[in-house]
Protein backbone atom coordinates (compact mmCIF):
# COMPACT_ATOMS: atom_id res chain seq x y z
CA UNK A 1 0.00 0.00 0.00
CA UNK A 2 1.21 3.28 -1.11
CA UNK A 3 1.72 5.71 1.87
CA UNK A 4 -0.63 8.62 1.27
CA UNK A 5 0.40 11.99 0.64
CA UNK A 6 -1.62 15.07 2.44
CA UNK A 7 -3.23 17.22 -0.39
CA UNK A 8 -1.42 20.70 -0.41
CA UNK A 9 -3.06 23.61 0.76
CA UNK A 10 -5.74 25.17 -1.10
CA UNK A 11 -6.25 22.30 -3.80
CA UNK A 12 -8.70 19.96 -2.25
CA UNK A 13 -11.41 19.35 -4.88
CA UNK A 14 -14.28 20.97 -3.92
CA UNK A 15 -16.57 19.67 -7.10
CA UNK A 16 -15.75 17.57 -10.10
CA UNK A 17 -14.26 20.10 -12.73
CA UNK A 18 -12.08 21.37 -15.43
CA UNK A 19 -9.37 22.09 -13.59
CA UNK A 20 -8.32 18.83 -12.17
CA UNK A 21 -6.86 18.10 -15.39
CA UNK A 22 -4.10 20.19 -14.12
CA UNK A 23 -3.41 17.95 -10.89
CA UNK A 24 -0.68 15.26 -10.96
CA UNK A 25 -1.35 12.12 -10.01
CA UNK A 26 -0.71 12.20 -6.52
CA UNK A 27 -2.26 15.22 -5.91
CA UNK A 28 -5.59 13.64 -7.73
CA UNK A 29 -5.56 10.65 -5.48
CA UNK A 30 -4.95 13.31 -1.93
CA UNK A 31 -7.27 15.82 -3.20
CA UNK A 32 -10.47 14.31 -4.95
CA UNK A 33 -12.81 12.80 -2.06
CA UNK A 34 -13.96 9.43 -3.33
CA UNK A 35 -17.90 10.13 -1.91
CA UNK A 36 -17.87 13.38 -4.46
CA UNK A 37 -16.32 11.84 -7.51
CA UNK A 38 -19.17 9.09 -7.21
CA UNK A 39 -21.74 11.90 -6.87
CA UNK A 40 -20.55 13.99 -9.74
CA UNK A 41 -19.38 10.88 -11.98
CA UNK A 42 -21.59 12.69 -14.70
CA UNK A 43 -18.66 15.35 -14.57
CA UNK A 44 -15.83 13.17 -15.82
CA UNK A 45 -16.71 13.05 -19.42
CA UNK A 46 -16.79 16.36 -19.65
CA UNK A 47 -12.90 16.56 -18.53
CA UNK A 48 -10.27 16.25 -20.67
CA UNK A 49 -8.67 13.50 -18.29
CA UNK A 50 -5.48 12.04 -19.28
CA UNK A 51 -5.50 7.96 -19.44
CA UNK A 52 -3.02 7.96 -15.61
CA UNK A 53 -5.44 10.15 -14.34
CA UNK A 54 -8.70 8.17 -15.19
CA UNK A 55 -6.78 5.12 -13.54
CA UNK A 56 -6.47 7.26 -10.52
CA UNK A 57 -10.21 8.10 -10.32
CA UNK A 58 -11.22 4.55 -11.12
CA UNK A 59 -8.75 3.48 -8.35
CA UNK A 60 -10.85 5.75 -5.85
CA UNK A 61 -13.93 4.32 -6.72
CA UNK A 62 -12.66 0.64 -6.69
CA UNK A 63 -11.54 1.81 -3.05
CA UNK A 64 -14.62 3.46 -2.31
CA UNK A 65 -17.13 0.46 -3.46
CA UNK A 66 -14.98 -2.84 -3.42
CA UNK A 67 -17.65 -5.00 -3.93
CA UNK A 68 -18.68 -3.25 -7.23
CA UNK A 69 -19.77 0.10 -7.86
CA UNK A 70 -23.90 0.96 -6.83
CA UNK A 71 -25.81 1.54 -10.26
CA UNK A 72 -26.05 5.23 -10.07
CA UNK A 73 -22.10 5.55 -10.65
CA UNK A 74 -22.34 2.38 -13.48
CA UNK A 75 -25.09 4.76 -15.58
CA UNK A 76 -22.04 7.91 -15.23
CA UNK A 77 -19.30 6.14 -15.95
CA UNK A 78 -19.49 6.89 -19.67
CA UNK A 79 -15.53 6.23 -21.03
CA UNK A 80 -14.41 5.78 -17.88
CA UNK A 81 -16.69 2.44 -18.84
CA UNK A 82 -13.61 1.57 -21.04
CA UNK A 83 -11.01 1.66 -18.11
CA UNK A 84 -13.20 -1.21 -16.53
CA UNK A 85 -11.80 -5.15 -16.76
CA UNK A 86 -14.19 -8.23 -16.70
CA UNK A 87 -13.59 -8.68 -13.56
CA UNK A 88 -14.35 -5.54 -12.45
CA UNK A 89 -17.94 -6.21 -14.55
CA UNK A 90 -18.74 -9.04 -13.02
CA UNK A 91 -19.34 -7.34 -9.66
CA UNK A 92 -22.09 -4.99 -10.87
CA UNK A 93 -25.53 -5.66 -10.74
CA UNK A 94 -26.92 -3.78 -13.72
CA UNK A 95 -30.67 -3.42 -13.98
CA UNK A 96 -31.74 -0.69 -16.21
CA UNK A 97 -31.77 -0.58 -19.49
CA UNK A 98 -30.87 2.77 -19.53
CA UNK A 99 -27.64 2.28 -17.98
CA UNK A 100 -26.81 -0.76 -20.54
CA UNK A 101 -27.64 1.89 -23.43
CA UNK A 102 -25.71 4.07 -21.60
CA UNK A 103 -22.42 1.83 -21.39
CA UNK A 104 -23.09 0.41 -25.25
CA UNK A 105 -22.84 4.25 -26.48
CA UNK A 106 -19.65 4.58 -25.31
CA UNK A 107 -18.45 1.26 -27.35
CA UNK A 108 -20.58 1.72 -30.64
CA UNK A 109 -19.27 1.42 -33.82
CA UNK A 110 -16.66 -0.38 -32.11
CA UNK A 111 -16.13 -4.80 -31.51
CA UNK A 112 -17.79 -6.16 -29.04
CA UNK A 113 -15.28 -5.93 -26.20
CA UNK A 114 -14.84 -8.82 -23.45
CA UNK A 115 -15.88 -5.17 -21.18
CA UNK A 116 -19.05 -5.45 -22.97
CA UNK A 117 -19.87 -9.38 -23.68
CA UNK A 118 -19.43 -9.32 -19.65
CA UNK A 119 -21.64 -6.59 -19.37
CA UNK A 120 -24.70 -7.88 -21.42
CA UNK A 121 -23.97 -11.32 -19.76
CA UNK A 122 -25.04 -10.16 -16.46
CA UNK A 123 -27.46 -7.79 -17.33
CA UNK A 124 -29.46 -10.56 -19.02
CA UNK A 125 -28.51 -13.07 -16.61
CA UNK A 126 -30.09 -10.29 -14.23
CA UNK A 127 -33.37 -10.55 -15.89
CA UNK A 128 -33.83 -13.61 -16.48
CA UNK A 129 -34.77 -13.98 -19.64
CA UNK A 130 -34.12 -11.90 -23.36
CA UNK A 131 -36.89 -9.70 -23.47
CA UNK A 132 -37.75 -7.48 -26.27
CA UNK A 133 -36.58 -4.21 -25.30
CA UNK A 134 -33.04 -5.81 -24.62
CA UNK A 135 -33.16 -7.99 -27.39
CA UNK A 136 -34.16 -4.60 -29.33
CA UNK A 137 -31.18 -2.42 -27.56
CA UNK A 138 -28.37 -5.13 -28.35
CA UNK A 139 -29.03 -5.77 -31.88
CA UNK A 140 -29.00 -2.04 -32.77
CA UNK A 141 -25.36 -1.31 -31.26
CA UNK A 142 -24.39 -5.42 -32.15
CA UNK A 143 -26.52 -6.59 -34.95
CA UNK A 144 -24.44 -10.16 -34.84
CA UNK A 145 -25.63 -10.31 -30.87
CA UNK A 146 -28.44 -12.81 -31.64
CA UNK A 147 -26.44 -15.10 -33.52
CA UNK A 148 -23.16 -15.10 -31.17
CA UNK A 149 -25.51 -16.95 -28.03
CA UNK A 150 -25.62 -20.35 -28.01
CA UNK A 151 -28.96 -22.65 -28.77
CA UNK A 152 -28.99 -22.81 -25.33
CA UNK A 153 -28.89 -18.97 -24.60
CA UNK A 154 -31.37 -18.68 -27.62
CA UNK A 155 -33.92 -20.99 -25.67
CA UNK A 156 -34.49 -18.30 -23.11
CA UNK A 157 -35.65 -16.08 -25.92
CA UNK A 158 -39.50 -15.02 -25.42
CA UNK A 159 -41.42 -15.18 -28.68
CA UNK A 160 -42.32 -11.84 -28.15
CA UNK A 161 -39.09 -10.94 -28.83
CA UNK A 162 -38.89 -12.16 -32.24
CA UNK A 163 -40.35 -8.98 -33.67
CA UNK A 164 -36.97 -6.86 -32.70
CA UNK A 165 -35.02 -9.48 -34.68
CA UNK A 166 -33.86 -8.09 -37.82
CA UNK A 167 -32.76 -10.19 -41.09
CA UNK A 168 -29.17 -8.44 -40.94
CA UNK A 169 -29.38 -9.52 -37.35
CA UNK A 170 -29.28 -13.49 -38.21
CA UNK A 171 -26.50 -12.87 -40.99
CA UNK A 172 -23.67 -15.30 -38.91
CA UNK A 173 -26.63 -17.68 -37.03
CA UNK A 174 -25.70 -21.32 -38.05
CA UNK A 175 -28.11 -24.09 -38.56
CA UNK A 176 -28.09 -24.82 -35.11
CA UNK A 177 -29.20 -21.69 -33.77
CA UNK A 178 -31.86 -20.94 -36.57
CA UNK A 179 -33.21 -24.50 -35.41
CA UNK A 180 -33.92 -22.66 -32.16
CA UNK A 181 -34.78 -19.48 -33.41
CA UNK A 182 -37.41 -20.83 -36.31
CA UNK A 183 -40.61 -22.19 -33.76
CA UNK A 184 -40.29 -19.16 -31.65
CA UNK A 185 -40.53 -17.16 -35.23
CA UNK A 186 -43.29 -18.96 -36.34
CA UNK A 187 -45.45 -19.06 -33.09
CA UNK A 188 -44.77 -15.03 -32.99
CA UNK A 189 -46.28 -14.10 -36.41
CA UNK A 190 -48.68 -16.97 -36.62
CA UNK A 191 -51.46 -14.29 -36.74
CA UNK A 192 -50.36 -12.58 -39.94
CA UNK A 193 -51.72 -13.34 -43.13
CA UNK A 194 -49.72 -15.49 -45.50
CA UNK A 195 -47.35 -12.72 -48.07
CA UNK A 196 -47.03 -10.36 -44.55
CA UNK A 197 -46.07 -13.50 -42.91
CA UNK A 198 -43.80 -15.23 -45.32
CA UNK A 199 -41.81 -11.54 -45.19
CA UNK A 200 -41.47 -11.75 -41.28
CA UNK A 201 -40.41 -15.62 -41.66
CA UNK A 202 -38.35 -15.51 -44.14
CA UNK A 203 -34.98 -14.78 -42.36
CA UNK A 204 -35.35 -17.92 -39.73
CA UNK A 205 -36.15 -20.57 -42.69
CA UNK A 206 -33.07 -21.93 -41.98
CA UNK A 207 -34.48 -23.34 -39.35
CA UNK A 208 -37.67 -24.96 -40.67
CA UNK A 209 -38.57 -27.76 -41.22
CA UNK A 210 -40.09 -30.05 -44.94
CA UNK A 211 -43.14 -30.15 -43.76
CA UNK A 212 -43.31 -26.24 -43.42
CA UNK A 213 -41.57 -25.81 -46.77
CA UNK A 214 -44.21 -27.91 -48.09
CA UNK A 215 -47.11 -25.25 -46.60
CA UNK A 216 -44.95 -22.28 -48.08
CA UNK A 217 -44.98 -23.69 -51.70
CA UNK A 218 -49.09 -23.79 -51.99
CA UNK A 219 -48.50 -20.44 -50.85
CA UNK A 220 -47.22 -18.78 -53.79
CA UNK A 221 -44.69 -17.26 -51.93
CA UNK A 222 -42.02 -16.65 -54.71
CA UNK A 223 -38.53 -17.27 -52.26
CA UNK A 224 -35.45 -16.13 -53.26
CA UNK A 225 -32.46 -18.48 -54.27
CA UNK A 226 -30.64 -16.74 -51.64
CA UNK A 227 -33.18 -17.93 -48.82
CA UNK A 228 -33.62 -21.11 -50.64
CA UNK A 229 -29.45 -21.83 -50.16
CA UNK A 230 -29.78 -21.22 -46.72
CA UNK A 231 -32.15 -23.94 -45.74
CA UNK A 232 -31.56 -27.46 -43.78
CA UNK A 233 -30.33 -29.78 -46.63
CA UNK A 234 -32.45 -32.18 -44.50
CA UNK A 235 -35.50 -30.53 -45.54
CA UNK A 236 -34.99 -29.18 -49.13
CA UNK A 237 -34.19 -33.41 -49.86
CA UNK A 238 -38.00 -34.56 -49.20
CA UNK A 239 -39.68 -31.91 -51.39
CA UNK A 240 -41.04 -32.83 -54.88
CA UNK A 241 -39.63 -30.89 -58.50
CA UNK A 242 -43.35 -29.33 -58.58
CA UNK A 243 -42.85 -28.69 -54.34
CA UNK A 244 -39.61 -26.53 -55.50
CA UNK A 245 -41.25 -25.23 -58.34
CA UNK A 246 -44.21 -23.55 -56.78
CA UNK A 247 -41.94 -22.31 -53.74
CA UNK A 248 -39.35 -20.42 -56.02
CA UNK A 249 -42.06 -19.25 -58.21
CA UNK A 250 -40.32 -17.05 -61.00
CA UNK A 251 -36.86 -17.89 -58.80
CA UNK A 252 -36.39 -21.43 -60.39
CA UNK A 253 -34.28 -20.59 -63.13
CA UNK A 254 -31.83 -19.70 -60.37
CA UNK A 255 -31.27 -23.07 -59.98
CA UNK A 256 -28.89 -24.18 -62.92
CA UNK A 257 -26.57 -21.63 -61.25
CA UNK A 258 -26.01 -23.42 -57.95
CA UNK A 259 -27.14 -26.55 -59.01
CA UNK A 260 -23.33 -27.63 -57.59
CA UNK A 261 -23.91 -26.38 -54.80
CA UNK A 262 -26.01 -27.81 -51.49
CA UNK A 263 -28.73 -28.04 -50.82
CA UNK A 264 -29.58 -28.06 -54.73
CA UNK A 265 -27.18 -30.55 -55.31
CA UNK A 266 -28.30 -32.79 -53.24
CA UNK A 267 -32.01 -32.09 -53.91
CA UNK A 268 -31.21 -33.08 -57.84
CA UNK A 269 -29.24 -36.59 -56.82
CA UNK A 270 -32.73 -37.26 -55.24
CA UNK A 271 -35.30 -36.33 -58.08
CA UNK A 272 -36.04 -38.42 -61.54
CA UNK A 273 -34.50 -36.88 -64.42
CA UNK A 274 -38.35 -36.88 -65.69
CA UNK A 275 -38.71 -34.55 -63.15
CA UNK A 276 -36.01 -32.53 -63.60
CA UNK A 277 -36.52 -32.16 -67.38
CA UNK A 278 -39.85 -30.87 -66.85
CA UNK A 279 -38.29 -27.19 -65.72
CA UNK A 280 -36.52 -27.23 -68.86
CA UNK A 281 -33.07 -25.82 -66.96
CA UNK A 282 -30.98 -28.05 -68.03
CA UNK A 283 -30.67 -29.82 -64.66
CA UNK A 284 -28.50 -33.10 -64.44
CA UNK A 285 -27.60 -35.82 -62.21
CA UNK A 286 -31.51 -36.74 -60.70
CA UNK A 287 -32.19 -40.60 -61.35
CA UNK A 288 -32.57 -42.49 -64.45
CA UNK A 289 -35.54 -43.09 -65.73
CA UNK A 290 -36.50 -46.70 -64.75
CA UNK A 291 -34.73 -46.92 -61.33
CA UNK A 292 -35.84 -47.51 -58.35
CA UNK A 293 -35.78 -45.22 -55.56
CA UNK A 294 -35.48 -46.94 -52.06
CA UNK A 295 -35.87 -44.37 -49.24
CA UNK A 296 -33.62 -46.22 -46.95
CA UNK A 297 -34.23 -43.89 -44.15
CA UNK A 298 -37.91 -45.39 -44.17
CA UNK A 299 -36.99 -48.80 -44.33
CA UNK A 300 -34.62 -48.15 -41.13
CA UNK A 301 -37.10 -46.81 -39.55
CA UNK A 302 -39.95 -49.74 -39.76
CA UNK A 303 -37.61 -52.17 -39.04
CA UNK B 1 -18.49 40.40 -27.36
CA UNK B 2 -16.14 38.14 -26.68
CA UNK B 3 -12.92 38.74 -28.09
CA UNK B 4 -8.97 37.73 -28.15
CA UNK B 5 -6.52 40.14 -29.54
CA UNK B 6 -3.17 39.04 -30.75
CA UNK B 7 -0.19 41.07 -30.73
CA UNK B 8 1.34 41.93 -34.31
CA UNK B 9 3.50 40.11 -36.71
CA UNK B 10 6.71 39.79 -35.82
CA UNK B 11 10.09 39.36 -37.87
CA UNK B 12 12.98 37.58 -36.19
CA UNK B 13 16.70 36.15 -36.47
CA UNK B 14 17.51 32.80 -35.32
CA UNK B 15 18.64 32.41 -31.91
CA UNK B 16 16.39 36.16 -31.12
CA UNK B 17 13.87 35.56 -28.35
CA UNK B 18 10.41 36.36 -28.85
CA UNK B 19 7.10 37.03 -26.46
CA UNK B 20 3.81 37.21 -28.51
CA UNK B 21 0.78 37.99 -26.44
CA UNK B 22 -3.03 37.58 -27.01
CA UNK B 23 -5.72 39.12 -24.77
CA UNK B 24 -8.86 38.70 -23.66
CA UNK B 25 -11.92 40.77 -23.08
CA UNK B 26 -15.53 40.14 -22.94
CA UNK B 27 -15.81 37.32 -20.68
CA UNK B 28 -14.17 36.77 -17.40
CA UNK B 29 -11.05 35.71 -18.22
CA UNK B 30 -10.00 33.29 -15.51
CA UNK B 31 -12.72 30.94 -16.53
CA UNK B 32 -11.77 29.91 -19.68
CA UNK B 33 -8.30 28.17 -20.67
CA UNK B 34 -6.62 29.33 -23.27
CA UNK B 35 -4.75 26.83 -25.73
CA UNK B 36 -2.14 28.30 -28.57
CA UNK B 37 -2.07 26.30 -31.87
CA UNK B 38 0.85 26.58 -34.59
CA UNK B 39 0.12 26.32 -38.03
CA UNK B 40 3.35 26.69 -40.44
CA UNK B 41 2.52 28.17 -44.44
CA UNK B 42 0.51 26.11 -46.07
CA UNK B 43 -0.03 23.59 -43.40
CA UNK B 44 -2.52 22.13 -40.93
CA UNK B 45 -2.81 22.98 -37.59
CA UNK B 46 -0.99 21.40 -34.64
CA UNK B 47 -1.97 22.10 -31.33
CA UNK B 48 0.91 23.34 -28.82
CA UNK B 49 -0.36 23.64 -25.53
CA UNK B 50 -2.58 25.25 -22.85
CA UNK B 51 -2.95 27.34 -19.45
CA UNK B 52 -5.74 27.64 -16.82
CA UNK B 53 -5.45 31.46 -16.47
CA UNK B 54 -6.80 31.46 -12.98
CA UNK B 55 -3.97 29.16 -11.91
CA UNK B 56 -1.21 29.29 -14.74
CA UNK B 57 -1.34 25.94 -14.72
CA UNK B 58 0.12 24.51 -18.11
CA UNK B 59 -0.36 21.35 -20.15
CA UNK B 60 2.28 21.06 -23.47
CA UNK B 61 2.49 19.13 -26.31
CA UNK B 62 5.21 16.77 -25.97
CA UNK B 63 6.12 18.35 -29.24
CA UNK B 64 6.27 21.71 -27.85
CA UNK B 65 7.19 21.00 -24.37
CA UNK B 66 10.55 23.17 -23.75
CA UNK B 67 10.91 24.58 -27.09
CA UNK B 68 7.90 27.39 -25.75
CA UNK B 69 6.73 28.21 -22.48
CA UNK B 70 2.85 29.92 -22.08
CA UNK B 71 2.07 31.83 -19.32
CA UNK B 72 -0.61 34.43 -18.82
CA UNK B 73 -1.04 37.56 -16.26
CA UNK B 74 -4.84 37.11 -15.25
CA UNK B 75 -4.66 41.41 -13.68
CA UNK B 76 -4.67 42.48 -17.51
CA UNK B 77 -5.98 39.37 -19.38
CA UNK B 78 -3.42 38.37 -21.31
CA UNK B 79 -1.77 35.13 -22.47
CA UNK B 80 1.57 34.99 -23.56
CA UNK B 81 3.97 32.61 -25.85
CA UNK B 82 7.85 33.13 -26.01
CA UNK B 83 10.98 31.62 -27.56
CA UNK B 84 14.04 32.23 -25.78
CA UNK B 85 15.99 31.04 -29.26
CA UNK B 86 13.95 30.71 -32.21
CA UNK B 87 14.53 29.14 -35.53
CA UNK B 88 13.83 29.24 -38.89
CA UNK B 89 11.29 26.35 -38.44
CA UNK B 90 9.44 28.67 -36.12
CA UNK B 91 8.01 30.23 -38.81
CA UNK B 92 4.65 30.15 -38.87
CA UNK B 93 0.98 31.94 -38.13
CA UNK B 94 0.40 31.28 -34.43
CA UNK B 95 -3.22 31.53 -33.28
CA UNK B 96 -4.44 31.94 -29.32
CA UNK B 97 -8.13 30.15 -28.82
CA UNK B 98 -10.52 30.03 -25.67
CA UNK B 99 -11.09 26.62 -24.36
CA UNK B 100 -15.25 26.06 -23.81
CA UNK B 101 -15.79 22.80 -22.50
CA UNK B 102 -15.27 20.11 -25.59
CA UNK B 103 -13.83 22.62 -28.22
CA UNK B 104 -12.04 26.13 -28.59
CA UNK B 105 -15.01 28.42 -29.36
CA UNK B 106 -13.85 31.85 -29.59
CA UNK B 107 -10.16 32.53 -31.96
CA UNK B 108 -7.48 35.22 -32.04
CA UNK B 109 -7.02 36.92 -35.26
CA UNK B 110 -3.43 34.93 -35.22
CA UNK B 111 0.18 36.25 -34.78
CA UNK B 112 2.54 35.35 -37.90
CA UNK B 113 5.63 34.75 -37.11
CA UNK B 114 8.90 34.96 -39.44
CA UNK B 115 11.86 34.27 -38.39
CA UNK B 116 14.91 34.04 -41.40
CA UNK B 117 18.58 35.77 -41.37
CA UNK C 1 2.93 14.10 -37.23
CA UNK C 2 -0.69 14.17 -38.02
CA UNK C 3 -2.79 11.61 -35.34
CA UNK C 4 -5.93 12.03 -37.05
CA UNK C 5 -6.62 11.35 -40.95
CA UNK C 6 -8.68 13.08 -43.20
CA UNK C 7 -9.41 13.04 -46.69
CA UNK C 8 -7.08 16.01 -48.39
CA UNK C 9 -9.96 17.08 -50.57
CA UNK C 10 -13.79 16.76 -50.91
CA UNK C 11 -16.31 18.48 -53.50
CA UNK C 12 -19.84 19.03 -53.84
CA UNK C 13 -22.70 21.36 -55.82
CA UNK C 14 -24.77 23.55 -54.11
CA UNK C 15 -27.44 21.98 -52.72
CA UNK C 16 -25.86 18.87 -52.16
CA UNK C 17 -24.52 17.05 -48.99
CA UNK C 18 -21.56 15.73 -47.59
CA UNK C 19 -19.45 13.96 -45.62
CA UNK C 20 -15.87 14.72 -44.21
CA UNK C 21 -14.58 11.85 -42.62
CA UNK C 22 -11.82 12.33 -39.58
CA UNK C 23 -10.05 8.89 -38.31
CA UNK C 24 -8.19 8.18 -35.57
CA UNK C 25 -7.53 5.26 -32.65
CA UNK C 26 -9.48 4.18 -29.46
CA UNK C 27 -7.38 6.41 -27.62
CA UNK C 28 -8.09 9.84 -29.21
CA UNK C 29 -11.39 9.53 -31.43
CA UNK C 30 -12.78 6.13 -30.05
CA UNK C 31 -11.73 6.87 -26.31
CA UNK C 32 -13.98 10.19 -25.30
CA UNK C 33 -16.46 12.68 -26.41
CA UNK C 34 -13.96 14.89 -27.17
CA UNK C 35 -14.19 15.54 -31.55
CA UNK C 36 -14.57 18.92 -32.22
CA UNK C 37 -14.67 20.40 -36.26
CA UNK C 38 -13.09 24.06 -37.41
CA UNK C 39 -14.09 25.75 -40.51
CA UNK C 40 -11.48 27.58 -42.03
CA UNK C 41 -11.44 30.57 -44.88
CA UNK C 42 -7.95 31.38 -46.64
CA UNK C 43 -5.83 34.07 -44.13
CA UNK C 44 -8.79 33.75 -41.73
CA UNK C 45 -8.73 32.13 -38.15
CA UNK C 46 -10.31 28.91 -37.61
CA UNK C 47 -13.55 28.64 -36.37
CA UNK C 48 -15.62 26.30 -34.22
CA UNK C 49 -18.93 24.46 -36.45
CA UNK C 50 -19.38 21.23 -34.06
CA UNK C 51 -17.88 20.02 -30.20
CA UNK C 52 -18.80 17.18 -27.97
CA UNK C 53 -18.77 15.53 -31.24
CA UNK C 54 -22.34 16.28 -32.30
CA UNK C 55 -22.95 19.86 -30.78
CA UNK C 56 -23.44 22.74 -32.80
CA UNK C 57 -22.30 26.41 -31.12
CA UNK C 58 -24.68 29.51 -31.29
CA UNK C 59 -24.49 30.93 -34.84
CA UNK C 60 -23.90 28.08 -36.53
CA UNK C 61 -25.94 27.02 -39.06
CA UNK C 62 -28.24 23.40 -38.66
CA UNK C 63 -26.86 22.23 -42.06
CA UNK C 64 -23.66 21.19 -40.10
CA UNK C 65 -23.68 18.41 -38.30
CA UNK C 66 -21.42 16.09 -36.35
CA UNK C 67 -21.47 12.13 -35.62
CA UNK C 68 -18.93 9.35 -34.27
CA UNK C 69 -18.61 5.69 -34.75
CA UNK C 70 -15.95 3.57 -33.63
CA UNK C 71 -12.63 5.45 -34.02
CA UNK C 72 -13.96 7.34 -36.82
CA UNK C 73 -15.70 10.66 -36.21
CA UNK C 74 -17.61 12.24 -39.44
CA UNK C 75 -18.93 15.76 -40.26
CA UNK C 76 -22.02 16.32 -42.37
CA UNK C 77 -22.94 19.28 -44.31
CA UNK C 78 -26.38 19.45 -45.89
CA UNK C 79 -27.48 21.92 -48.72
CA UNK C 80 -24.33 23.23 -49.76
CA UNK C 81 -23.63 26.92 -50.11
CA UNK C 82 -20.83 28.74 -51.55
CA UNK C 83 -19.30 30.15 -48.79
CA UNK C 84 -18.78 26.39 -47.35
CA UNK C 85 -15.88 26.21 -49.21
CA UNK C 86 -13.30 26.43 -47.07
CA UNK C 87 -10.32 23.85 -45.10
CA UNK C 88 -11.76 21.70 -42.17
CA UNK C 89 -10.21 20.15 -39.57
CA UNK C 90 -11.41 17.87 -36.76
CA UNK C 91 -9.67 17.85 -32.75
CA UNK C 92 -9.65 15.37 -30.91
CA UNK C 93 -8.61 14.70 -27.49
CA UNK C 94 -5.45 12.00 -27.02
CA UNK C 95 -6.07 10.72 -23.07
CA UNK C 96 -2.91 8.81 -23.03
CA UNK C 97 -0.54 11.50 -24.24
CA UNK C 98 -2.51 13.94 -22.48
CA UNK C 99 -2.99 16.50 -25.66
CA UNK C 100 -5.32 18.04 -28.02
CA UNK C 101 -4.35 16.72 -32.10
CA UNK C 102 -5.76 17.86 -35.02
CA UNK C 103 -6.71 15.95 -38.60
CA UNK C 104 -4.51 17.15 -41.53
CA UNK C 105 -7.11 19.10 -43.19
CA UNK C 106 -10.20 18.71 -45.94
CA UNK C 107 -10.04 21.51 -48.55
CA UNK C 108 -13.89 21.33 -49.85
CA UNK C 109 -14.28 22.81 -52.93
CA UNK C 110 -18.01 23.63 -54.14
CA UNK C 111 -18.63 22.94 -57.61
Known amino acids: EVEKTACPSGKKAREIDESLIFYKKWELEACVDAALLATQMDRVNAIPFTYEQLDVLKHKLDELYPQGYPESVIQHLGYLFLKMSPEDIRKWNVTSLETLKALLEVNKGHEMSPQVATLIDRFVKGRGQLDKDTLDTLTAFYPGYLCSLSPEELSSVPPSSIWAVRPQDLDTCDPRQLDVLYPKARLAFQNMNGSEYFVKIQSFLGGAPTEDLKALSQQNVSMDLATFMKLRTDAVLPLTVAEVQKLLGPHVEGLKAEERHRPVRDWILRQRQDDLDTLGLGLQGGIPNGYLVLDLSMQEALS | QVQLVQSGAEVKKPGESLKISCKGS????????IGWVRQMPGKGLEWMGI????????RYSPSFQGQVTISADKSISTAYLQWSSLKASDTAMYYC??????????WGQGTLVTVSS | DIALTQPASVSGSPGQSITISCTGT?????????VSWYQQHPGKAPKLMIY???SRPSGVSNRFSGSKSGNTASLTISGLQAEDEADYYC???????????FGGGTKLTVL
Open chain 2, 26 to 33: GYSFTNYW
Open chain 3, 26 to 34: SSDVGGNNF
Open chain 3, 52 to 54: YGD
Open chain 3, 91 to 101: QSWDAPMGMWV
Open chain 2, 97 to 106: ARYMKGGYDY
Open chain 2, 51 to 58: IDPRESFT
